[in-house]
Amino acid sequence: MAEPRQEFEVMEDHAGTYGLGDRKDQGGYTMHQDQEGDTDAGLKESPLQTPTEDGSEEPGSETSDAKSTPTAEDVTAPLVDEGAPGKQAAAQPHTEIPEGTTAEEAGIGDTPSLEDEAAGHVTQEPESGKVVQEGFLREPGPPGLSHQLMSGMPGAPLLPEGPREATRQPSGTGPEDTEGGRHAPELLKHQLLGDLHQEGPPLKGAGGKERPGSKEEVDEDRDVDESSPQDSPPSKASPAQDGRPPQTAAREATSIPGFPAEGAIPLPVDFLSKVSTEIPASEPDGPSVGRAKGQDAPLEFTFHVEITPNVQKEQAHSEEHLGRAAFPGAPGEGPEARGPSLGEDTKEADLPEPSEKQPAAAPRGKPVSRVPQLKARMVSKSKDGTGSDDKKAKTSTRSSAKTLKNRPCLSPKHPTPGSSDPLIQPSSPAVCPEPPSSPKYVSSVTSRTGSSGAKEMKLKGADGKTKIATPRGAAPPGQKGQANATRIPAKTPPAPKTPPSSGEPPKSGDRSGYSSPGSPGTPGSRSRTPSLPTPPTREPKKVAVVRTPPKSPSSAKSRLQTAPVPMPDLKNVKSKIGSTENLKHQPGGGKVQIINKKLDLSNVQSKCGSKDNIKHVPGGGSVQIVYKPVDLSKVTSKCGSLGNIHHKPGGGQVEVKSEKLDFKDRVQSKIGSLDNITHVPGGGNKKIETHKLTFRENAKAKTDHGAEIVYKSPVVSGDTSPRHLSNVSSTGSIDMVDSPQLATLADEVSASLAKQGL
């Protein structure tokens, strides 16, 4: 998944040019949370550009005209986030992805299911059937590879497979694939940002050809939640709104270029164990981006927190698109029936922001909130299974998911880090329709259980939003379906990325992680229409809630009783998710376990850093932040490499209930080597503006834990400076459990909030 960055940067292919498709990824994919509800911003599902290998043909010799670029995760080789100097995924050596490293980019990525694979076997169309896994309901539709957690399309898988994401380079540095994709379709910018100009490749014109002029454009990887199905090929986004094809930024695990990988091929980044079964899910009726196709993805959960840096958010609109990272799921897995709507709104993955730092212009009269909204998908739902009433209320607001096309939810599989086998289709397209009823208000993050891959499905709202279903894996224990509370498993493995795109270096300012247009295997960008405004009922409940589940029942009580203790300094704690140090590549999809030894969260940077697999941060650390008093202004989460993040165990979940959290120190969690994120061409980089989260007391942040931080604002504030929350990305969870002080603090905050009637 693209790493959230404060600045939008283009991730460049390690080798220079990946086989990027024509589709151009636009500015970082960012998730916008509607104040009233999380909306998904479709992740761009463009294959990452694969650096040319020594034996590679001319870079860019291959051109891609894909409407949407597969996410970058296709690339097998781990992608390193190079966008920020010195920000490469820690411990993961930046490896260039050799040409062809992504199967998706090669057009041979893993398909959402193995159904078709047997010769003579009648392939089952995943779309035909609806499967409920682990209590998660998937709407009918093709199994989506929902590797894009925040964005639709599993490749990943949530989106279709996409090329793995190339390492980022500072914007403007990304080489363009001269021969690469001709034109990469742009996400429906208007859907997300409305007036933002589209910088991406021309939308696909009639005949499926991209509009001229963008021909040589390099796919720019946008910051995208790559948890979305990356493994599946980029889904074709039919212009749902504004006639623009939504681009999902799902990234797929590395897969063979141009081939959706049918069976999960163990890859370091790719999910070693891919769920072969696809669960067909019918897409909700309604115009939507193409159905996402599911891909097999490890069950591990990755949190995709996509924060739209500097994107002005219309608070009035619940329609803002939050990139939704779909959790990679087994092909059969579909988006769970979320009580809270998974990010319904399709995220404009490809909306190029000139600097990507520039906030999208907000409608006049509406306060612009730049707060990146992290959308966490909550796997566990309310006991009723729908999540809190707010969520339910939200559901009404959410338009039924529409599938413009069958877009694969990209849940690209990521080869194990370093794995260079792009053949695995990181993201097979899978449609991850989200039940229209499911409130979009709360996105649920499902943590993947085990290494078994769960397909991530993108859900496409009727409004044309692509939605990514989180992996069907059971919700992490302790998670409750609270309304508006988003739980983020700390360690959900990133969703596979979308198929690699044609080898075009991402343009500057664009991240090359998804740089290649969605390779066939990568879901194309999906247009995500802003989710419908959620009922105002949600707002009242929007209280920043940070709850830290007590480790033990007794501990919880004790915490409540414990007087607030100064929080341990979280300063200088950098948890680099995706850093090799913290990442453990487990064969089932290259889980990345991030252990933050330092408790100081102040300086934790969360980079979802691997570009290739960044797509695979399904549910990876999506944090639903209702920006209110919470001042997260300096927390930067880079979701850089999601490849290995795929396997972030959804550890303890922490809800911060306190209305106002001051994280004084910058917490930057660097998630992720993207080496294995290769999945995802098209894997969008997530850029998360840093916000300061001041923990008055030192708290331990265990990225391994799936601590969920739910920020609920009692009221959607019209605050135009949502910066406080805008950059908070928690790919790593804060383990409140380990910090009684935090727990106490949370309790106190909760009490204060209660007193305030919040």
């Epitope: 086989g19 041979i108 399309m153 279709p160 094809p245 096309k405 879901p523």
Partner: antibody, heavy 117, light 109 residues
Framework: QVQLQQSGTELAKPGASVKLSCKAS????????MHWIKQRPGQGLEWIGY????????KYNQNFRDKATLTADESSNSAYMQLNSLTYEDSAVYYC??????????WGQGTTLTVSS | QAVVTQESALTTSPGETVTLTCRSS?????????ANWVQEKPDHLFTGLIG???NRAPGVPARFSGSLIGDKAALTITGAQTEDEAIYFC?????????FGGGTKLTVL
Amino acid sequence: QVQLQQSGTELAKPGASVKLSCKASGYTFTHYWMHWIKQRPGQGLEWIGYIYPTNDYTKYNQNFRDKATLTADESSNSAYMQLNSLTYEDSAVYYCARAGNRVFDFWGQGTTLTVSS
Amino acid sequence: QAVVTQESALTTSPGETVTLTCRSSTGAVTTSNFANWVQEKPDHLFTGLIGGTNNRAPGVPARFSGSLIGDKAALTITGAQTEDEAIYFCALWYSNLWVFGGGTKLTVL
């Protein structure tokens, strides 16, 4: 069963354009890449490009960038390749091949294009 | 552009094991080349056998296997059968395009 049915033999004149079709059945069309390969008599196979029907993502061999245009129609589960400005050298057998899970697993029977004045 | 080289012809006997190789002009073949092996039988009947170096396509007999041998991709047919007589093409991915080899005509006598 997975099948790729390609259009029949095409006869065209130099400078003309032709659109070859490849109708897929037996699988979810959008889940796989569709590649197009050219085989000229006495020569090997030459990869033209591929399209991912889900999002119409295409990638071309640079050599065919100006020659071929790949499209897909999900409604008909068909992939198309339009060849422009035909020359004699475009005479060949063109194959569509489904690719997924790292393999070019299923191929069409091929469409023979003859460019002749 | 890279050139992919294959043996022009090989002959084997039923039950024998035969290995076809695929060399890249650009250097060693790696998994990143996603070596694919395609079988062509008379009348332009192509069937994908192996992809991603060693992934057998569905329905392909287990006697077909792919691997990397030295710096080359290899297709090994263990226990060749008469019906395996065909032309085998190797395809390698080079970051931005697929390059097919000239094909190896395998004769099973």
